[in-house]
């Protein structure tokens, strides 16, 4: 039975050109994490394998950095980075747990319009 739960950083609104950290944390299970995949839509961004370490997809190498921890740092954000990101925890013996984070990247002009939020 899968008893674990995934906690995420929560959704994030950021400004074009900035950088943000996406993080997930698996709790309430003793299952062993064998691999964590980070995906956006149907694209694989990065893999953190318990034995082999990190692999960043070539198309994201310039703007994606591993960590902190099992998280992912996205740099030089563009409006095209807006979308849903998934942290997919492969565990034994539980199976797969998935967390969802939505990242909204705003043009500076939009970010300033009526903005009273702190932008990362």
């Amino acid at each position: 039975m899968m008893t674990g739960t995934i906690e995420t950083t929560g959704n994030i609104s950021a400004e074009k050109g900035g950088s943000i950290i996406l993080q997930c944390h698996l709790s309430s299970t003793t299952a062993q994490v064998t691999q964590v995949n980070w995906e956006q839509q149907d694209q694989l961004l990065a893999i953190c394998n318990a034995d082999l370490g990190w692999h960043i997809s070539p198309s994201f190498k310039d703007r994606v950095a591993p960590g902190p921890g099992l998280g992912l740092t996205l740099q030089s954000l563009t409006v095209n980075d807006t979308g849903e990101y998934f942290c997919i925890y492969h565990t034994y013996p539980d199976g797969t747990y998935t967390g969802r984070i939505f990242l909204e990247v705003l043009e500076s002009s939009v970010a300033e319009h009526g903005a009273r939020f702190q932008i990362p």
Partner: antibody, heavy 117, light 112 residues
């Protein structure tokens, strides 16, 4: 002035599919995500999903995966929601709503869908 | 999914009253940057919902200052200082911090 103009009311038969449109004006269509919200029985509001007009990316409430399909036509600044395999449970008012920082700042006027044989 | 509980379900008022509506979430609505995406809406009969408050306490453009929002973590409140006829309708809170966004069940503001 920001405006979201939705298509008119629909009466459809069970098992059919239908598409609701939401035409945006008064702002840069690709600069904001577009959400869809269901209101059943004149009360409960449920988030169906959203689409990112700039890149076509989508995010769905798991409850509506397979029921709703979201698309956009950037050239006409129009968002669409197709509802599939309709049943009486799908009878509701559907709204499109623009979002900024995860709040829905402008809403369409709503489209009433009635599913009945 | 994050469960959002609104109280009361119904709020009978007289014009001029001050009222509070509560919104509680099943987990904290602060993201890792300390930003909380909690908004409030008024839905009047025959109209579309309208945004009143975003980011806990920021009034949307054109919203009168008799509306105010407060709270943090899992507990949030909408206050209306002097009820006017145009304030009657259904009030909803919405959490946008966690996927999927979820609405409270609504509070009906009606005349006693």
């Amino acid at each position: 002035e920001v405006q979201l103009q939705q298509s008119g009311p629909e009466l459809v038969k069970p098992g059919a599919s239908m598409k609701i449109s939401c035409k945006a004006s008064g702002y840069s269509f690709t600069g904001y995500t577009m959400n869809w919200v269901k209101q059943s029985h004149g009360k409960n509001l449920e988030w169906i999903g959203l689409i990112v007009p700039s890149n076509g990316g989508t995010s769905y409430n798991q409850k509506f995966k397979g029921k709703a399909t979201l698309t956009v036509d950037k050239s006409s600044s129009t968002a669409y929601m197709e509802l599939l395999s309709l049943t009486s449970e799908d009878s509701a008012v559907y709204y499109c709503a623009r979002s900024l920082r995860f709040s829905f700042d402008y809403w369409g006027q709503g489209t009433t869908l009635t599913v009945s044989s | 999914d994050v469960v959002v509980t609104q109280t009361p379900l119904s709020l009978p008022v007289s014009f001029g009253d001050q009222v509070s509506i509560s919104c509680r979430s099943s987990q904290s609505l602060a993201n890792s940057y300390g930003t909380t995406y909690l908004s409030w809406y008024l839905h009047k009969p025959g109209q579309s919902p309208q945004l009143l408050i975003y980011g806990i306490s920021n009034r949307f453009s054109g919203v009168p200052d008799r509306f105010s929002g407060s709270g943090s973590g899992t507990d949030f409140t909408l206050k209306i200082s002097t009820i006017k006829p145009e304030d009657l309708g259904m009030y909803y809170c919405l959490q946008g911090t966690h996927q999927p966004p979820t609405f409270g069940g609504g509070t009906k503001l009606e005349i006693k």
